[in-house]
């Protein structure tokens, strides 16, 4: 337990005085926080948080879902924690099945254990399929299993968390990994026509096609040397995974001579930007 010099605020003291505690399902959890400036206990697991203003946290009949981190905080904002595992042979994993990974980043499969004393806490492919050869993971019984450096090829990968028990694999509920692609190139932009010659009063309509790996690509029509917001309409499609197309159509229903000029379709993503232009020349009716 923490100890500091007198006069200096110190963190609360927790009994039992250990960082981890393992209890059996149905047993009592009894945690005592000793501090003259006690404020609260906080319990955290996955996305769940509970608070308790009593300095003794008592759970009479522990369940697997009482597994988690119990933190005592004092009036100085100092805290101390104990992690409690509630061993339940019928519920080895707590799960949050949402699983999104950004390409090239690590992502956490949230399947913390209710009992850390297990063998081969791992990821397994669904229906006995092997995991991708290059997939690497880091297990943490209190948090789950971290997939290292998510690849685009892992999109829609079906996974289970797994442990070995008496020679057999025990699997968690299944997870489906959804990969958000990283931008590794600028958007591809093209325009329906490079130049237009119209008579005054005719309709001007031009379409810019923007292609990228995801819909979070930004695009806009701009008139060169002008801040005026142009009216544009969008259509978009996902042609399978990581193949997004947007069509941005700029329309001037009745073109005037002073509408003549260069119009730019501009698109950007986190990698960079691209643009393409079209020229409009409007002549009077004469």
């Amino acid at each position: 337990q923490p100890s500091v010099s007198p006069g200096e605020p110190s963190p609360p003291s927790i009994h039992p005085g250990k960082s981890d505690l393992i209890v059996r399902v149905g047993d009592e959890i009894r945690l005592l926080c000793t501090d003259p400036g006690f404020v609260k206990w906080t319990f955290e697991i996955l996305d769940e948080t509970n608070e308790n203003k009593q300095n003794e946290w008592i759970t009479e009949k522990a369940e697997a879902t009482n597994t988690g981190k119990y933190t005592c905080t004092n009036k100085h904002g100092l805290s101390n924690s104990i992690y409690v595992f509630v061993r339940d042979p019928a519920k080895l994993f707590l799960v949050d099945r949402s699983l999104y990974g950004k390409e090239d980043n690590d992502t956490l499969v949230r399947c913390p254990l209710t009992d850390p004393e297990v063998t081969n806490y791992s990821l397994k492919g669904c229906q006995g399929k092997p995991l991708p050869k290059d997939l690497r993971f880091i297990p943490d019984p209190k948090a789950g299993i971290m997939i290292k450096s998510v690849k685009r090829a892992y999109h829609r990968l079906c996974l289970h968390c797994s442990v070995d028990q008496e020679g057999k694999s025990v699997l968690s509920e299944k997870f489906i990994l959804k990969v958000r692609p990283a931008f590794k190139a600028v958007p591809v932009v093209s325009v329906s026509k490079a130049s237009y010659l119209l008579r005054e009063g005719e309709e001007f309509t031009v379409t810019c096609t923007i292609k990228d790996v995801s819909s979070s690509v930004y695009s806009t029509w701009k008139r060169e040397n002008s801040q005026t917001k142009l009216q544009e309409k969008y259509n978009s499609w996902h042609h399978g995974d990581f193949n997004y197309e947007r069509q941005a159509t700029l329309t001037i229903s009745s073109a005037r001579v002073n509408d003549s000029g260069v119009f730019m379709c501009y698109a950007n993503n986190t990698f960079g930007s691209a643009n393409v232009t079209t020229t409009l020349e409007v002549v009077d009716k004469g």
Epitope: N120, L135, R136
Partner: nanobody, 128 residues
Amino acid sequence: QVQLVESGGGLVQAGGSLRLSCVASGRTFSSYAMGWFRQGPGKEREFAAAILSNGLTTYYADSVKGRFTISRDNAKDTVYLQMNSLKPEDTANYYCAAAFTPEFRDGGIWDDASVDYWGQGTQVTVSS
């Protein structure tokens, strides 16, 4: 820097037992996952067993499951590999390994690319 020194290897008859030890010196032993790899004659180095820093969560290769047991004593900065029902195919140099962030691959196999520190190895020979 972490130094790993293995001991306990030797010659044993098939069906016999050996207990390997690996003592770590240097940084905080309790923060590291520890494990054992082995390299048989003319073979590539392969994973045998591992134990996470919590001292409770363990990993075994299929070839040693049910026969080998890994354990650690953080007070003694030591990791052990108890090897029972030894077979001639267990003959190998056994290397102790430490990693702050161990990475595993399919089948719960510790990827040796994520090992931070290696021991020099201890020879185990199982005669038939």
